[in-house]
């Protein structure tokens, strides 16, 4: 009896794992083995595919074959017993195009209200992704084990920290990789769960802001308790993208080591041009807080995103605010060459109730004011670019009294 060729050959490539699956054509024939040949583009001869010779099952692995993953390859299969079937040719394919990104490796660390996620490619030193290592981005789905309500976080890198979590709570997550340059979305990792710790005695510092004064950067933050010492560290932001490297060499800012105030001042020349992460930690001598949320600090923008300068024209029921370019030292205006949005906060001098206006225009009306009342105003600028998402610090507050009633405009 003539042996029939195997049919329906499927090639599955995940990272550097090359798997072939096929269907037997004739289930009734026993003790059949299968063998594959391969042929590279531009070659006439067929070569035996190592790892896929005389296979008794309907699956084989040819990962050991050192292929150029960007080069087209053709496969053929036949069945063998006493005689052999005719060859069945598989459509040619390029391994890189066919490859899927496998599940990444995930390593979790817990704090009281945060989880640090370290992500590595599933295959270390992968040949398939050798040229794309730095292009991987990741997305994750996280949920409280008790509720199952999922939150998705997109476009993260090999280290990501999730804040504002609840202490002593189990969170679960899964991660997948993407190579957006090649339109490839990977497979999810297994689910990993971790429990946040008991609440720490000392909370981390909050609301970290960087501003520029003369030739210095001024770093400010808020803290709950007095009589503390603080330290500030920085890291090049691009290091979070380095696949497989999970040793982050945070560096001290010398002028911000063991400071006793909730701010520190350091020269601009501490940082070369670039994007950095900054974090602050508090200590009372016995206990230490966890690190604050990491803020992104872009020297290019920070150097120019100064608080706006404004004038107020007072009417009986409103203020007209005219926003001008901020002044550098030497009283020269700074040219802002990117679009800004302005946040204006105002309040009655005798009250703490603040109201907010967000405006793109540089002339703003603050309506619904009471006559003969002192109001205070402060403003800050934000970049409109979502990716940069920078804010200046607030300007100093300016207080003005509204005019008596029925003032004509």
């Amino acid at each position: 009896k003539n042996l029939k060729s195997p049919q329906k050959v499927e090639v599955d490539i995940i990272d550097d794992n090359f798997i072939l699956r096929w269907n037997r054509s004739d289930e009734s024939v026993g003790n059949v083995t299968f063998s594959f040949d391969y042929q590279k583009t531009g070659m006439d001869n067929w070569i035996k595919l190592s790892g896929c010779q005389n296979i008794t099952s309907t699956k084989c692995n040819f990962s050991s074959l050192k292929l150029n993953v960007y080069e087209e390859i053709k496969l053929r299969i036949r069945a063998e017993k006493e005689n052999t079937s005719s060859w069945y040719e598989v459509d040619s394919f390029t391994p890189f195009r066919k490859a899927q990104i496998g599940p990444p490796e995930v390593h979790l660390e817990a704090e009281d209200k945060a989880i640090v996620i370290h992500i590595s490619p599933g295959t270390k030193d992968s040949v398939m992704w050798a040229l794309d290592g730095l292009s991987f981005t990741y997305s994750l789905v996280i949920w409280k084990n008790s509720s199952g309500v999922e939150e998705r976080i997109e476009n993260i890198y090999s280290r990501h920290k999730i804040y504002k979590l609840s202490p002593e709570t189990t969170y679960c997550l899964k991660v997948k990789a993407a190579l957006l340059t090649s339109w490839k979305i990977g497979v999810y990792s297994p689910v990993h769960c971790i429990k946040t710790t008991v609440e720490n005695e000392l909370p981390p510092p909050e609301n970290i802001e960087v501003s520029v004064q003369n030739q210095n950067y001024v770093l400010k933050w808020d803290y709950t308790y007095a009589n503390m010492t603080f330290q500030v560290q920085w890291l090049h932001a691009f290091l979070k993208r380095n696949p497989g490297n999970h040793l982050y060499k945070w560096k001290q800012i010398p002028d911000c080591e063991n400071v006793k105030t909730t701010q520190c001042v350091f020269p601009q020349n501490v940082f070369q041009k670039g994007i950095y992460l900054l974090r602050v930690q508090a200590s009372d001598g016995n206990n230490t807080s966890f690190w604050s949320e990491e803020i992104k600090f872009d020297t290019e923008i920070q150097a120019f995103l100064l608080p706006p300068v404004f004038n107020i024209r007072s009417l009986s029921d409103s203020f007209h605010i005219y926003i001008g370019a901020p002044k550098q030292s030497g009283n020269t205006p700074v040219i802002q060459d990117y679009p800004l949005i302005y946040e204006i906060i105002f309040w009655e001098n005798t009250s703490n109730a603040e109201r907010k206006i967000i405006e793109k225009k540089t002339d703003v009306t603050v309506p619904n004011l009471k006559p003969l009342t002192v109001y205070c105003v402060k403003a800050r600028a934000h970049t409109m670019d979502e990716k940069l998402n920078k804010s200046s610090v607030f300007s100093d507050a300016v207080c003005e009294k509204t005019k008596p009633g029925n003032t004509s405009k």
Partner: antibody, heavy 118, light 107 residues
Framework: QVQLVQSGAEVVKPGASVKVSCKGS????????MHWVKQAPGQGLEWIGR????????KYAPKFQGRVTITADTSTSTVYLELSSLRSEDTAVYYC???????????WGQGTLVTVSS | DIQLTQSPSFLSTSVGDRVTITCKAS??????VVWYQQKPGKSPKVLIY???YRVSGVPSRFSGSGSGTEFTLIISSLQPEDFATYYC?????????FGQGTKLEIK
Amino acid sequence: QVQLVQSGAEVVKPGASVKVSCKGSGFNIKDYYMHWVKQAPGQGLEWIGRIDPEDAETKYAPKFQGRVTITADTSTSTVYLELSSLRSEDTAVYYCARGGNFYVMDYWGQGTLVTVSS
Amino acid sequence: DIQLTQSPSFLSTSVGDRVTITCKASQNVGTNVVWYQQKPGKSPKVLIYSASYRVSGVPSRFSGSGSGTEFTLIISSLQPEDFATYYCQQKNNYPYTFGQGTKLEIK
């Protein structure tokens, strides 16, 4: 493969100084932290300090600050521990260790016994 | 400095036994704890890092758990080669500190 090879045993007099070396191979020391750990005879492990060979930044345990200096020579992939004003309680085995992913001391040298004796 | 207190300091035990070693930190260190094994005359060897991650090549009978201030190393079924001294270490803050060690002896 990753290896840390330390210099040989030393016998030194009280008040003197000693410099112990640790040569790394199979990895680039600039990409890691390098730590030193003390173990007195029959005692536990004590962290002395670490260096970032890339920029020579150091951290020391307060107990050792001032009497200990950690340095690195990236051209020879070697880190050094210098102990000064030695006293009998400095008699110990001193280990170097590599600080790798997740800040773990993942590879250790074989240890160097320093004996302080008159 | 963060103090780490291990218990017990000594343990007489037999092959096949399940062994639990605990490590208490004087303040919250998250999951930043490492466990080492040291045999006489040898350098320490990492077993567990980040409280619960087993190093590649370490037998599955070793497991770690805990977070915050309380951590545990479990050896599910003691083997002859496991008689050694075990140390916990925190890597949350400088200076890094070690527990005083737990010595496992053959009963």
